[in-house]
Interface confidence: low
């Protein structure tokens, strides 16, 4: 930000009424009135270029320092070219000297050169040559010097002419302040610029109304430089929850809008399924029946639990059931739907029911399912099963009601036995099988049916209580179709699939395990 100048002395603005002291009195410097753009202007002028050694002083009035530490002196002046005078005016100069003196009181007309300290020799960038002067072209020079630190109550400036043709049109003395500033929603007070060039005064800012330093952020600070410019901003303030930045201030969110945390972002419109918010809202309340999960951002619409799975089927396959369902028609506005499957079994004879999680096996864990199907196995035959599929989402835990669909299935058969060929010879086949342990207690006997492949007219049956059998008196090098079926008190269980097993040829005789 640009420095603010506080003017202590302005000759040009004073309209010739400052009454500066000239020394020697009545010689050298003289106050002249002129007209510029039809306005009277005043200047202190001296032009004793032909008179040999000159030592003409012009002293300002006493200037009260106030709070200034370093002052800046801006001079506007013209200097005529010494060559524009007859014979080049051998004693003519083209510079003058600038002095200052500090004091705690006004000495009035008591002028003492020895009290003054030289600031600098002032030389023009451009001199007014004859042709310019005759044509009334002005060559206005602007020079600035600074002095500091000042410590007394006030000071004088003085101009020493040593034989130049000079007109002082403007003498302006000022000090600099870093102006009051609003930056980064922080207010920095007007601050007097320091006097030492390398130093930067650190100034703490205060957050504007309804602004805060963000958590973990730095407090706002700026540095006021000697030239009155603010430099090196550190930290910032952000509009607090419920407020947004409008120009250099924090303004409450309008009704129907909200902001849930201190940030640079603007207020957001209340999302779907929320009630209209009041002014300055930090969040928008959910409509009745709609909820916000703890981890849901305030910008997300309010949601509700899903409806039940739309369509549920249970397809029995022996001692297995495949459950399939479609997603709920109403997701509740969320995508985090999961499914839970629970199982209940009922004995047909007694009508007694109970949970069956412990006795069945699921193809994947039945809680937190994301897929829409699961296979349940190890079901007992001649048992009624009821499966419940519940749909849940991130807000289901906020309500007591549940969204589920059920499907029932009766298991009438045992699961088909899994059959293996244990060994073979030219005239025999050794076969074994297995069924799930829960079903084994219900099996009375196993029936093994076998026949030659391609012979549909005759087949053989063997019954056994065990889990294996050797089929003898078979023809060598012949393929037999073998099927095993469990027999229960209620009737036949599911048959295994038909397996093709081949006896050995005479050349490859001897028992061979497969």
């Amino acid at each position: 930000a640009q420095g603010k100048e506080v003017v202590l002395l302005d000759f040009a603005a004073a309209g010739g009424e400052l009454g500066w002291l000239t020394h020697p009195y009545g010689k050298g410097w003289d106050l002249m009135q002129n007209i510029m753009n039809d306005m009277p202007i005043y200047m202190y002028s001296v032009c004793n270029v032909m008179s040999g050694d000159q030592d003409n002083w012009l002293r300002t009035n006493w200037v009260y320092r106030g709070e200034a530490e370093r002052i800046f002196i801006e001079l506007k002046f013209t200097v005529r070219d010494c060559n524009s005078f007859p014979g080049g005016a051998s004693s003519c100069k083209e510079t003058f000297n600038l002095y200052y003196a500090e004091s705690d009181l006004d000495y009035g007309t008591n002028f003492q050169k020895r009290l003054f300290t030289k600031i600098d020799t002032i030389a023009p960038d451009e001199i007014t040559v004859s042709s310019d002067f005759e044509a009334r072209h002005v060559k206005l020079n602007v020079e600035e010097r600074s002095v500091g630190p000042l410590t007394r109550k006030g000071f004088y400036l003085a101009f020493q002419d040593i034989g130049a043709c000079v007109a002082l049109l403007s003498v302006r003395v000022y000090y600099k302040k870093c102006p009051e500033l609003l930056q980064g929603l922080a207010h920095f007070p007007e601050t007097i610029a320091g006097s030492d060039a390398p130093s930067l005064a650190t100034v703490a800012g205060t957050c504007v109304d309804h602004a805060v330093v963000p958590p973990g952020g730095e407090e706002p600070r700026m540095h006021c430089a000697v030239d009155g410019e603010w430099l090196v901003p550190i930290g910032q303030c952000l509009c607090q929850a419920g407020y947004e930045k409008v120009e250099d201030a924090c303004q409450a969110c309008s009704p129907g809008f909200f902001k849930f945390e201190a940030s640079e972002s603007p207020c957001l419109e209340c999302p779907e399924h929320t009630l209209p918010s009041p002014e300055g809202a930090t969040s928008c309340e959910c409509e009745e029946g709609f909820f916000r999960a703890p981890q849901d951002p305030a910008s997300m619409p309010c949601t509700r639990p899903p409806s039940a799975p739309h369509y549920l089927t249970a397809v029995g396959m022996g001692a297995k059931v495949e459950l399939r369902w479609t997603p709920p028609q109403d997701s509740g506005g969320r995508e985090d739907i999961v499914y839970s499957v629970t199982c209940e079994q009922c004995w047909p004879e007694s009508g007694e029911c109970g949970p069956c999680e412990a006795s069945v096996r699921y193809s994947e864990p039945p809680h937190g399912l994301t897929r829409t199907s699961v296979t349940v196995s190890d079901l007992e035959p001649h048992m009624n099963y009821t499966f419940t599929v519940e749909a849940r989402n991130g807000v289901s835990g906020l309500v007591t009601s549940r969204s589920f669909r059920t499907a029932s299935v009766s298991i009438n058969q045992t699961e088909p036995p899994k059959v293996r060929l244990e060994g073979r010879s030219t005239t025999s086949l050794s076969v074994s099988w297995s069924i799930p342990p829960p079903q084994q207690s219900r099996v009375w006997k196993y029936e093994v049916t076998y026949r030659k492949k391609g012979d549909s007219n005759s087949y053989n049956v063997r019954r056994t209580e065990g889990f294996s059998v050797t089929l003898d008196d078979l023809a060598p090098d012949t393929t037999y179709l073998v099927q095993v079926q469990a027999l229960t008190q209620e009737g036949q269980g599911a048959g295994s699939k038909v397996h093709e097993f081949q006896t050995l040829s005479p050349e490859g005789s001897g028992n061979l395990a497969v």
């Epitope: 002249m32 009135q33 002129n34 007209i35 510029m36 753009n37 039809d38 202007i41 200047m43 002028s45 032009c47 506007k76 002046f77 013209t78 200097v79 005529r80 007014t128 002067f133 009334r136 072209h137 002005v138 206005l140 043709c165 000079v166 007109a167 049109l169």
Partner: antibody
Framework: EVQLLESGGGLVQPGGSLRLSCAAS????????MAWVRQAPGKGLEWVSR????????HYADSVKGRFTISRDNSKNTLYLQMNSLRAEDTAVYYC?????????????????????WGQGTLVTVSS | DIQMTQSPSSLSASVGDRVTITCRAS??????LAWYQQKPGKAPKLLIY???NLHTGVPSRFSGSGSGTEFTLTISGLQPDDFATYYC?????????FGQGTKVEIK
Amino acid sequence: EVQLLESGGGLVQPGGSLRLSCAASGFTFSHYMMAWVRQAPGKGLEWVSRIGPSGGPTHYADSVKGRFTISRDNSKNTLYLQMNSLRAEDTAVYYCAGYDSGYDYVAVAGPAEYFQHWGQGTLVTVSS
Amino acid sequence: DIQMTQSPSSLSASVGDRVTITCRASQSISTWLAWYQQKPGKAPKLLIYKASNLHTGVPSRFSGSGSGTEFTLTISGLQPDDFATYYCQQYQSYSRTFGQGTKVEIK
């Protein structure tokens, strides 16, 4: 060659209005301050008004203040004087005059506000 | 306003004469003074500015002097073309007032 040519004069009744024009040529009009100077029959010269090179500032003699308005159109190299509420004592030959605009500041010298160039004049007669 | 007073108001002179016209200001005007020549039915012409500076094209027989409140216009050798009315004008103040004029006639 510098030329200033006034027009718009004539006979007008007291309380009436006239607009004088001054067409300039032969110099850079926009660099010059311009003025109107009048001369009543058989009398001396009286400065009336002036205008800066770019249209401001403007100044008026006390005798015409509030009634006369000076203006210029640099694109047309023309100076104007709008005269309202005319009185018998406004009867005069009105001269358009031009003078070098000078510069912002002149050290120990005055502004060049004398009249270097004059028009031939236009007669304004205010009579009932 | 600054008042400008010329004297004499008229004078008679012969060709070749040296003629001096005086102009007094009611207050100091430094050297901000111009002289004009006007012939009957014609516009004024600038002769001298800044009290003593001859305007371009003006014959050197015309000269001006003075500062503060007293100024003079001198015609060192009157020529037939010089019979006219002469006006002084100050340009230190806004109003740029003119003197009442001095008429130079043939004797």
